[in-house]
């Protein structure tokens, strides 16, 4: 049975130009975590595996930073980075948890975080 | 429990026009990304795109840009795909799938469409 | 586009049988790749996802393995209900793309 609940950085905004990190936080279960796969919307981001380490897709390499941790770090920004961001959690013996970040990058700079959530 | 409901055989003439449903139940329609698949006769299956019901965003295959165009209608949580100009080489079961992330959990049972005169 | 080649078109195998099918990527697809079973009249069915994570429900006698461009899927002891054809696909960037399948039947 899943128990575990992923809590994440929720609805998040940052000035274009700037980098923005990416957290997700898995609790509530002592599942192992096995990888965890970064996408926005259906295209993949990157992979970090636990024997294999990370995998950053090519065509973000330039942009995007591992960590820290199991999160994920955008630098650049653009307004085209504006959208949904997704971490999945793959896990033993549980299987997959999956948690969603909204990123609106802005034009002004007063771009300011918005509060945590939880996914269940 | 999760469930995609395809709508049923055509049979069209060539040149016309054909618009497939997706009807979904057990989740909420707005979730996840609908992708819809081909397979011709006797053959593999090839990936046409998707539709994200949230705000309607699609991406295409290459290939059938111009062939399909995706639609999604929220308040029946059904997704549509229309194909157009057909041929006989449009002859084929056409599958939709949701993308729980990363991988198609759960399919449409398929429809069947013959292009004929 | 990534091509995904699956060597085998058929494979012969007999009840208790080890079978493994193998699936080459054309490029460096880490771990993002899925295997489905579909048997005739049917839609496909999800067996494995992320190259070696068992999905939901799916019997333990289905394994994959690999990463980066070589992988593989694995039936360890053959029932008679696993008679059907089965997908590579990789999820790593669209347009996301099938293998032709291999179609495994009775020996």
């Known amino acids: 049975m899943m128990t575990g609940t992923i809590e994440t950085t929720g609805n998040i905004s940052a000035e274009k130009g700037g980098s923005i990190i990416l957290q997700c936080h898995l609790s509530s279960t002592t599942a192992q975590v096995t990888q965890v796969n970064w996408e926005q919307q259906d295209q993949l981001l990157a992979i970090c595996n636990a024997d294999l380490g990370w995998h950053i897709s090519p065509s973000f390499k330039d942009r995007v930073a591992p960590g820290p941790g199991l999160g994920l770090t955008l630098q650049s920004l653009t307004v085209n980075d504006t959208g949904e961001y997704f971490c999945i959690y793959h896990t033993y013996p549980d299987g997959t948890y999956t948690g969603r970040i909204f990123l609106e990058v802005l034009e002004s700079s007063v771009a300011e975080h918005g509060a945590r959530f939880q996914i269940p | 429990q999760v469930q995609l409901q395809q709508s049923d055989a055509e049979l069209v003439k060539p040149g016309a026009s054909v618009k497939i449903s997706c009807k979904v139940s057990g989740y909420t329609f707005t979730d996840h990304t609908i992708h819809w698949m081909i397979q011709r006769p006797e053959q593999g299956l090839e990936w046409i795109g998707y539709i994200y019901p949230r705000d309607g965003s699609t991406k295409y295959n290459e290939k059938f840009k111009g062939k399909a165009t995706l639609t999604a209608d929220k308040s029946s949580s059904t997704a549509y795909m229309q194909l157009n100009s057909l041929t006989s080489e449009d002859s084929a079961v056409y599958f939709c799938a949701r993308r729980a992330l990363p991988y198609f959990d759960c399919w449409g049972q398929g429809t069947t469409l013959t292009v004929s005169s | 586009d990534i091509v995904m080649t699956q060597s085998h078109k058929f494979m012969s195998t007999s009840v208790g049988d080890r079978v493994s099918i193998t699936c080459k990527a054309s490029q460096d697809v880490f771990t993002a790749v899925a295997w489905y079973q579909q048997k005739p009249g049917q839609s496909p069915k999800l067996l494995i996802y992320?190259?070696?994570y068992r999905f939901t429900g799916v019997p333990d006698r289905f394994t994959g393995s690999g990463s980066g461009t070589d992988f593989t899927f694995t039936i360890s002891s053959v029932q008679a209900e696993d008679l059907a054809v089965y997908y590579c696909?990789?999820?790593?960037?669209?347009?996301?793309?099938f293998g032709a399948g291999t179609k495994l039947e009775l020996r």
């Open positions: 696909q990789q999820h790593y960037s669209t347009p996301l793309t």
């Open positions: 992320s190259a070696s």
